[in-house]
Interface confidence: low
């Protein structure tokens, strides 16, 4: 006798294939691209999502850095190597044997090299700054209302523990959300700030990763919050290692 599930889908990741072959006939979902089993009660890791998304168009961008060690994702999409837990492998290489080191959110943190390049460890991104500019509104949003709404969003939509939302800054029209999560603070089962930031980024772009859920409808006291630009800065526990040539470019 089986107990095959009637409606087998992954609420937290639409980029999956699901079938009732999990324990006890429960729905088991595998990420497209990697075929890895994912836990549909929480966010899927960014590495597995990027791997699944590889058919999407390249989306490169260049940002102004808020501090000398902050990283931005200038390289756009690539087909990443993920470890058995779905995390980024410290060293990533492309089809032409060009390799580089990445941090825990998959952003390059060294110059590109060849197959001899060594990346000793996956360096954790412990501080993420999400910089948003909203469309003009009749007046500025109330800062405390905006703060509360964004904290609620990260808690309820992305299941990120409130303690990891360090601050919400607002100077119309710029909103900055600071996420902080040291290795020592992240308990088993805690959503990773990198994964939450990636889901948020895709939501803001109208590319929600959630299955069947409506797109993100952000409102502050009933007033729609429409984002027209998003920049995300990543700070690692160990500063990145780029040559002077890149730093002065």
């Amino acid at each position: 006798h089986t107990a095959a599930q009637d409606n087998c889908t992954c609420p937290t990741n639409k980029m999956t294939v699901c079938s009732p072959d999990g324990p006890g006939g429960r729905c088991q979902c595998r990420a497209l691209g990697s075929g890895m089993a994912v836990d549909c009660s929480t966010l899927t890791s960014k590495c597995l999502l990027l791997k699944a998304r590889m058919s999407a168009p390249k989306n490169a961008r260049t940002l102004v850095r808020p501090s000398e060690h902050a990283l931005v994702d200038n390289d756009g999409l690539y087909d990443p190597d993920c470890d058995p837990e779905g995390r980024f492998k410290a060293r990533q290489c492309n089809q032409t044997s060009v390799c580089w080191c990445v941090n825990s959110v998959g952003v390059r943190r060294t110059d590109k090299g060849d197959l001899s390049l060594r990346c000793d460890e996956l360096v954790r991104t412990h501080h993420i700054l999400i910089d948003l500019r909203h469309r003009p509104t009749a007046g500025a949003f109330n800062h405390s209302d905006l703060d509360a709404e964004l904290r609620r969003l990260f808690r309820e939509r992305y299941r990120l523990h409130p303690k990891f939302v360090a601050a919400v800054h607002y100077e119309q029209p710029t909103i900055q959300i600071e996420l902080r999560q040291n290795t020592s603070q992240k308990a088993a089962g805690d959503v990773d700030i990198g994964d939450a930031a990636y889901y948020f980024e895709r939501d803001i772009k109208g590319e929600s990763l959630f299955q069947g859920r409506g797109g993100l409808d952000l409102r502050v006291r009933g007033e729609p919050l429409q984002v027209e630009r998003t920049l995300i800065y990543y700070l690692d526990e160990i500063p990145p290692k780029f040559s002077m040539k890149r730093l002065t470019a």
Epitope: Q5, T9, P11, G24, R159
Partner: antibody, heavy 119, light 111 residues
Amino acid sequence: EVQLQQSGPEPVKPGASVKMSCKASGYTFTDYYMNWVKQSHGKSLEWIGYIYPNNGATGYNQKFKGKATLTVDKSSSTAYMELRSLTSEDSAVYYCAREDSYYYAMDYWGQGTSVTVSS
Amino acid sequence: DVVMTQTPLSLPVSLGDQASISCKSSQSLVHSNGNTFLHWYLQKPGQSPKLLIYKVSNRFSGVPDRFSGSGSGTDFTLKINRVEAEDLGVYFCSQSTHVYTFGGGTKLEIK
């Protein structure tokens, strides 16, 4: 604190139906499977089925297909089980139990709803 | 369905003694993902069951370390070191690798 509060005892007549409830609190209701388990007087436990509140997905023990129907109301974080065409064999205590998706075990149980089928 | 056979049916012990309960399954409980979904529950008189051990040997939160689980494949054991009065009740093993099934229960009582 995780709590599952079940509805009170149900004396019912043979052939009738009964719908019992299980109100969840202290956690995100939609993130966990809810299981239902039957315990006949002085006997072991029998798994009836589960429902995943996030999308309403259900799975049933073959023995209880057609006997039990599982539903949820997400707005009130409540799971329901309806039993139909009741006979004396259905007299038992019925438990709802939350299942953790990491270890597939029932980590929190309701206090049980006693159903007595008698004419 | 997978049949879970518990022995003994009744286990009289003296307080402070060690107790051991066996649970055998009619087929292997190793899932294709490598996990073994074998769990132990305790049902005290007049109460609902409570989770003690999950996935063979992991104590659930708040469960004292005098409880330990072991085994693999089809043979599993629950051990209780230094039995206390609050440990009395019926112990059930259960598997969720296949469609959920429970053992018949073992009643731990005072000798």
